[in-house]
């Protein structure tokens, strides 16, 4: 069995060959704020192995097609603003550009 | 209980389309986030794209640019449209519900509906 927040991508009769990330963040993972560029925001990492990074929803439930893989599963999305993380700690962000 | 009824498969010729639909009843709300799987004859079951609940879609390498996923919330009805139909896309199609849940281990093929055959030859 895949762990909490994987999904089995292949699977046999009884028994998952694949595992990967799950690729639809959970619905309060999703709302991030829109003026977020304006400010220094720090942003918590998920925990390795969970979820995936989240993009906003789109507006009106189907997205144009997008090219960023994830895992082995693509996302569509209309805005595609995520930033990977790729640490447990939190990262500071700035709009800045110091 | 949620129950599935998945219909639309037929025989196609590559290059052809079809529109699969997966008809959910037993649901409070408008329904948890939704799966497409496939088994194609001798194979394992495949992820082939997903959809949540407020409409965001993710598709397996395979389908991307081909094939569309969409749902009808009020209709409790999810849709998965199939273009430029290959014949290595021959296989039963089912839907599975809350995939993050009941899609961890096992086989997430068959356990809900029927699913419905698509075959594609010329």
């Known amino acids: 069995e895949c762990r909490p927040g994987m999904i089995c991508a292949t699977s046999a009769t009884n028994s998952c060959a694949r595992c990967v990330p799950y690729p639809i963040c959970a619905a309060e993972t999703v709302t991030k704020p829109q003026d977020m560029a304006e400010k220094d925001t720090t942003f918590e990492a998920p925990p390795l192995g969970t979820q995936p990074d989240c993009n906003p929803t789109p507006e009106n439930g189907e997205a144009p097609a997008s090219t960023s893989p994830t895992q082995s599963l693509l996302v569509d999305s209309q805005a595609s603003k995520t930033l990977p993380i790729p640490t447990s700690a939190p990262v500071a962000l700035s709009s800045t550009g110091k | 209980e949620v129950q599935l009824v998945e219909s639309g498969g037929g025989l196609v010729q590559p290059g052809g389309s079809l529109r699969l639909s997966c008809t959910a009843s037993?649901?409070?709300?408008?329904?948890?986030?939704m799966a497409w799987y496939r088994r194609a004859p001798g194979n394992e079951c495949e992820l082939v794209s997903i959809?949540?609940?407020?409409?965001?879609?993710y598709y397996t390498d395979s389908v991307k640019g081909r094939f569309t996923i969409s749902r009808d919330n009020a209709k409790n009805t999810v849709f998965l449209y199939l273009n430029s139909l290959q014949p290595e896309d021959t296989a039963v199609y089912y839907c599975a519900p809350d995939p993050r849940r009941n899609c961890r281990g096992g086989d997430c093929c068959g356990n809900w509906g029927p699913g419905t055959q698509v075959t594609v030859s010329s």
């Open positions: 959809i949540s609940a407020d409409g965001r879609t």
């Open positions: 037993g649901f409070t709300d408008d329904g948890p986030d």
